[in-house]
Interface confidence: low
């Protein structure tokens, strides 16, 4: 099953954001992912974890997941590489990045997008967007095209009240509200983008959806500016 | 058909508690994707959200009553009651109970598909 | 004061068309839902998620949301058309939020 969604969002304004990548699974979309460079796509390390011997691409310039678009393109992964200290039992570490099997051919539906590597706290109160394709209604009916929803970062002190996170939101991960609009699951991997530039990535750990005492989870790309520099060498 | 059915007394001395019940039939007021709610109109007035209880119970509450508010329930009268305490004349008001659906989450407000017929209630001494 | 804002009252001849408005700083966010309420009634759904209706509720009534301001349509208005009608969002808390709702006049 998809591994994740956009709750209370709408559908997106088709093929705004260039960045956004269907990592998919055997043809099924499995999570988000954003692309950060030509042949570069930066996802959810969880996302694979069920993965095994199954067939993973990158589909780019989508907005319909099954209808024809000239910008849509399927993209086989050459290489998959979890962050190193990505554990299956924690949301710590949790990034992933896909290189494609050739540089994408960019254009106005595919750009990558480029990512914080300032390593500051976005201030709390500021707008930003999530999208994801996935599950929509509790019928399970999933949406052919892209979602997205606008939601505030939610300071960490906050976050991390017993009530909430309980201490879990490290430096390296930031919150968003999820006061009945949030992400889900099966959006891991896709992209928190404030100010048009990306913050953060779609945490994929089992968390309740839509409550406002369980924000939105994500990790900080810029406190992983050094592996990302690293692996895209 | 879901329905519901608001009951309690309809005149209630200032400063006391004013308490209602929502007595649901034809659905559970456990079932996943809907949350129960309370709307007052005062007369004369537009009508003003209360508060809400998911169906795992949690509540949410109007931020201008959450210090006089609360929202409980009998799941196994498949009921939901409210309790609003401290009343002056300005909580006279018929008062609805509904049924809040969601669409994405357990709670994730959207609208109200179900309303009951709403109970006038009157503060005065 | 209401987070969303509608005209007090509105009249409207027998079988024109019929535009109630609801303007709120956040609905560009948040779906916009409307409510039919006949004196002495309940309120009634008649169009949610902007622009969808229910079943049961006749096709002169459509709804749209754009640029910050909701709009209920009522094509060629009935006599039984006539009540008040409140357009429900959130706000800025995501909480629910009603207008002050709109007396509808068929005359």
């Known amino acids: 099953p998809p591994r994740g969604r956009i709750l209370g969002g709408r559908e997106a304004e088709a093929h705004a954001r260039p960045y956004m990548a269907s990592v998919q699974l055997n043809g099924a979309h499995l999570c988000g992912g954003v692309l950060v460079a030509e042949q570069w796509v930066l996802s959810a390390a969880h996302c694979l974890e069920d993965a095994a011997d199954g067939k993973v691409q990158v589909l780019l310039g989508a907005h319909s997941l099954s209808q024809p678009e000239p910008s849509k393109r399927l993209y086989d992964v050459l290489r998959a590489v979890p962050h190193p200290d990505s554990q299956p039992d924690t949301i710590d570490h949790d990034l992933l990045l896909l290189q494609l099997s050739e540089k994408a051919t960019l254009g106005p539906a595919v750009r990558p997008l480029p990512w914080q590597r300032v390593d500051r706290d976005v201030a709390p109160g500021t707008l930003c967007d999530v999208a994801g394709w996935g599950i929509v209604n509790h019928a399970g009916r999933r949406p052919d095209s892209l979602q997205h929803v606008l939601l505030p970062v939610l300071d960490r002190a906050t976050c991390n009240r017993r009530t909430h996170h309980d201490g879990a939101i490290t430096e390296r991960l930031m919150c968003a509200e999820s006061n009945r609009r949030d992400s889900c699951k099966g959006d891991s991997g896709g992209p928190l983008v404030c100010g048009g530039v990306l913050e953060g990535v779609v945490t994929s750990g089992s968390r309740v959806c839509g409550n406002r005492k369980k924000p939105g989870i994500y990790t900080r790309v810029a406190s992983y500016a050094a592996w990302i520099d690293s692996v895209l060498a | 058909q879901v329905q519901v059915q608001e009951s309690g007394p309809g005149l209630v001395k200032p400063s006391q508690t004013l308490s209602l019940t929502c007595t649901v039939s034809g659905g559970s007021i456990s079932t996943s994707y809907y949350a129960w709610s309370w709307i007052r109109q005062p007369p004369g007035k537009g009508l003003e959200w209360m508060g809400d209880?998911?169906?795992?119970?949690?509540?949410y509450y109007s931020p201008s009553l959450e210090s006089r508010v609360t929202i409980s329930r009998d799941t196994s009268k498949n009921q939901f009651s409210l309790q609003l305490s401290s009343v002056t004349a300005q909580d006279t008001a018929v008062y609805y109970c509904?049924?809040?659906?969601?669409?994405?989450?357990?709670?994730?407000?959207?609208?109200?598909?179900?309303w009951g017929q709403g109970t006038l209630v009157t503060v005065s001494s | 004061s209401s987070a969303l804002t509608q005209p007090p009252a509105l009249s409207v001849s027998k079988g024109q068309t019929a535009r109630i408005t609801c303007q709120g700083n956040l609905l560009p966010r948040h779906y916009a839902h409307w409510y039919q309420q006949k004196t002495g009634q309940a309120p009634k759904l008649i169009v949610y998620?902007?622009?969808i209706r229910p079943s049961g509720i006749p096709e002169r009534f459509s709804g749209s949301n754009s640029g910050g301001v909701a709009t209920l349509t009522i094509s060629g208005a009935q006599a039984e058309d006539e009540a008040d009608y409140h357009c429900q969002s959130a706000d800025s808390n995501d909480d629910a939020v009603f207008g002050g709702g709109t007396q509808l006049t068929v005359l």
């Open positions: 998620d902007d622009n």
């Open positions: 509904a049924r809040l659906r969601s669409l994405y989450t357990d709670y994730d407000p959207h609208y109200y598909d179900y």
């Open positions: 209880i998911a169906n795992d119970g949690s509540t």
